[in-house]
């Protein structure tokens, strides 16, 4: 229904604290270098405004659109141009077009310094001190650095972090109790933040529709029992919720979310047996769980896909009646059967179903032509089941570490003038996959693996599309997002490149690697990992292991001396031709 | 909403030809294959003939075959079926349908052959 004041509708729904917190995140994404104390003095302003809305729907400016009020807050800020160079150019347009340049300019690798954690004794001093604003840096540091972070579980985030440091910050040794707590949420968020990210990409790039096949999918191998009808209004309410936050329009997302959360919870007995738990928590935890909720079981009693889909005389008829429709239907069918498979693949079975049908249907005999169609799909099921066997084998024979290096390996033989930090992060979070994934039952190994290996591989692509430097990326990252993972996958030693030549100051270390935290020391020994690669695209796995294990021991030995300065000094140069003649 | 309607039909002496047409709306023509069906009273369906989207590949029912004719006009999203010596035996309801269906999506085009 139309609301005479948008702003105080959503300020009722939300309440003061959501609201505050949505709002800091919406600017805190869209101009991500100004400070924490900017952000919340322009946060304090809105939210007095909307008060006043509240108290007087027609007072002035109460009628207008969020757009139009968070854009002209932001283009009131001092020095915009300066700050932000043409972003400025932004506010010289009107709404809906300001809106639509500001989100343009959303910077996915902003070059802000990493958010160092505070020592847990200063943490809770300011976390005591003053709650709402030590979180309210949070919202601010995490939405600056990821600028599609889903704001609504963004403030579950916060929650959690919440939560984390009351309970440490009582405890006598706060530093064991917050660093493993405080570390798990963070990886969980990042996960969150890529995978949202990539939810993004398939709604600017590929549209609603895209999403919406994602969508139908995804529910239909959580809800199995839940019919098509009830399975497409999920769908096109979470499209909507998505559509909402990828856009910038984050109170009308967390309000739409909470609305979606509290449907499912009314209809349960129409959508899963598993929602019991998660509708008896609170909002954002309800919704969280909402979110990743176990699989119901699936019906025992469905009958063979081919039925309706490939025996069935009406197949043609049936689909020139309604393509969305009954390829929806397909998706929905196969989807629920197989809760094993990634909704990437689904997707994939999806889009080659359609393809037969688009062939054979125009075809005088179309059932002998689809007739084998099923048969056709196992060539694209097992591609990604040997995936999930090779790198899991792999995984377990390396462990974490080692594994990174052979995917860091790899993906510089395949992609060779990408930048070595970019190769290097992309590296360290699809190896990542091998803890998060391999140590899952068989039945959840390749969902887990190849989605969350799609959206790592989406960043690879966002951050390339910056600066393009590799045909095999610009390649893969141009097709349709289901395709990439395989086409990245396929991928082999890029024959054009011309190696780099060999400087040895890329390969000298100085005695303070010896006191960095251990994540540091490893991303030190993969750039240097990284950088031989493309100085030798064709050494073998032998020569770089004997490479990597003599500066491994260099680092050992050098670091254990009694002057450091001087092991480094001497040592190191003599590493450095070990290397060359290693690789020669 | 997809809508085929059959027209053409009618009483005739067995030797003698009609021209039956399908026009088609609703959905994408060239897309589909085309087939006629026919039920005879008191009987099942029968297929009859089939043409694909372009119009370059044809097939028929031995019973038919050398004396029934199956075409199409994408500009105008028509199916034609022209009958040559006709019998009694192909005294039948006329159904024209997409891909390989075999259900009746029309109203049908009733064809009588007989002396």
């Known amino acids: 229904e139309a609301h005479k004041s948008e702003i105080a509708h959503r300020y009722n729904d939300l309440g003061e604290q959501h609201f505050k917190g949505l709002v800091l995140i919406a600017f805190s994404q869209y101009l991500q270098k100004c400070s924490y104390d900017e952000h919340a003095k322009l946060v304090q302003e809105v939210t007095d405004f909307a008060k006043t809305c509240v108290a007087d729907e027609s007072a002035a400016n109460c009628d207008k659109s969020l757009h139009t009020l968070f854009g002209d807050k932001l283009c009131a800020i001092p020095n915009l141009r300066e700050n932000y160079g043409e972003l400025a150019d932004c506010c010289t347009k009107q709404e809906p077009e300001r809106n639509e340049c500001f989100l343009q300019h959303k910077d996915d690798n902003p070059s802000l310094p990493p958010f160092e954690r505070p020592e847990a004794e200063a943490m809770c001093t300011s976390f005591k001190e003053n709650p709402t604003t030590f979180m309210g840096h949070y919202l601010h540091e995490v939405a600056r650095r990821h600028p599609y972070f889903y704001a609504p579980e963004l403030l579950y985030y916060a929650e959690q972090y919440n939560e984390i440091l009351t309970q440490c910050c009582a405890e006598a040794d706060k530093e064991s109790c917050l660093t493993p707590k405080l570390d798990g949420v963070k990886e969980k968020a990042l996960v969150s933040s890529v995978r949202q990210r990539m939810k993004c990409s398939s709604m600017q790039k590929f549209g609603e529709r895209a999403f919406k096949a994602w969508a139908v999918a995804r529910l239909s191998q959580t809800f199995p029992n839940a019919d098509f009808a009830e399975i497409t209004k999920l769908a096109t309410d979470l499209t909507k919720v998505n559509k909402e936050c990828c856009h910038g329009d984050l109170l009308e997302c967390a309000d739409d979310r909470a609305e979606l959360a509290k449907y499912m919870c009314e209809n349960q007995a129409t959508i899963s047996s598993k929602l019991q738990t998660c509708c008896d928590k609170p909002l954002l935890k309800k919704a969280h769980c909402l979110s990743e909720v176990e699989h119901d079981t699936m019906p025992a009693d469905l009958p063979a896909i081919a039925a309706d889909f490939v025996e069935d005389q009406e197949v043609c008829k049936n689909y020139a009646e309604a393509k969305d429709v009954f390829l929806g239907t397909f998706l929905y069918e196969y989807s629920r059967r197989h809760p094993d498979y990634s909704v990437s693949l689904l997707l994939r079975l999806a889009k080659k179903y359609e393809a037969t049908l688009e062939k054979c249907c125009a075809e005088a005999n179309p059932p002998a032509c689809y007739g084998t169609v099923l048969a056709e799909f196992q060539p694209l099921v097992e591609e990604p089941k040997n995936l999930v066997k090779t790198n899991c084998d792999l995984y377990e024979k390396l462990g974490e570490y080692g594994f990174q290096n052979a995917i860091l390996v790899r993906y510089t033989q395949k992609a060779p003038q990408v930048s070595t930090p970019t190769l290097v992060e992309a590296a360290r979070n699809l190896g990542r996959v091998g803890t998060k994934c391999c140590t899952l039952p068989e039945d959840q190994r390749l969902p887990c693996v190849e989605d969350y290996l799609s959206a790592i591989l989406n960043r690879v692509c966002l951050l390339h599309e910056k600066t393009p430097v590799s045909e095999h990326v610009t390649k893969c990252c141009s097709g349709s997002l289901v395709e990439r993972r395989p086409c990245f996958s396929a991928l082999t030693v890029d024959e054009t490149y011309v190696p780099k030549e060999f400087k040895a100051e890329t390969f000298t270390f100085h005695s303070d690697i010896c006191t960095l935290p251990e994540k540091e020391k490893q991303i030190k020994k993969q750039t240097a990992l990284a950088e031989l690669v493309k100085h030798k695209p064709k050494a073998t796995a032998e020569q770089l292991k004997t490479v990597m294990d003599d500066f491994a021991q260099f680092l050992d030995t050098c670091c254990k001396a009694a002057d450091k300065d001087t092991c480094f000094s001497t040592e190191g140069p003599n590493l450095v031709t070990r290397c060359k003649d290693a690789l020669a | 909403d997809v809508q085929l309607v059959e027209s053409g039909g009618g009483v005739v002496q067995p030797g003698n030809s009609l021209r039956l047409s399908c026009a088609a709306s609703?959905?994408?023509?060239?897309?589909?294959?085309m087939s006629w069906v026919r039920q005879a009273p008191g009987k099942g369906l029968e297929w009859v003939s089939s043409?694909?989207?372009?119009?370059?590949?044809?097939l028929y029912a031995d019973s038919v075959k050398g004396r029934f004719t199956i075409s199409r006009d994408n500009a105008k999203t028509t199916l034609y079926l022209q009958m040559n010596s006709l019998r009694p035996e192909d005294t039948a309801t006329y159904y024209c349908?997409?891909?390989?269906?075999?259900?009746?999506s029309g109203q049908g085009t009733l064809v009588t052959v007989s002396s």
């Open positions: 349908t997409i891909g390989g269906s075999l259900s009746r």
């Open positions: 609703g959905f994408t023509f060239t897309s589909f294959g």
């Open positions: 043409i694909s989207g372009s119009g370059s590949d044809t």
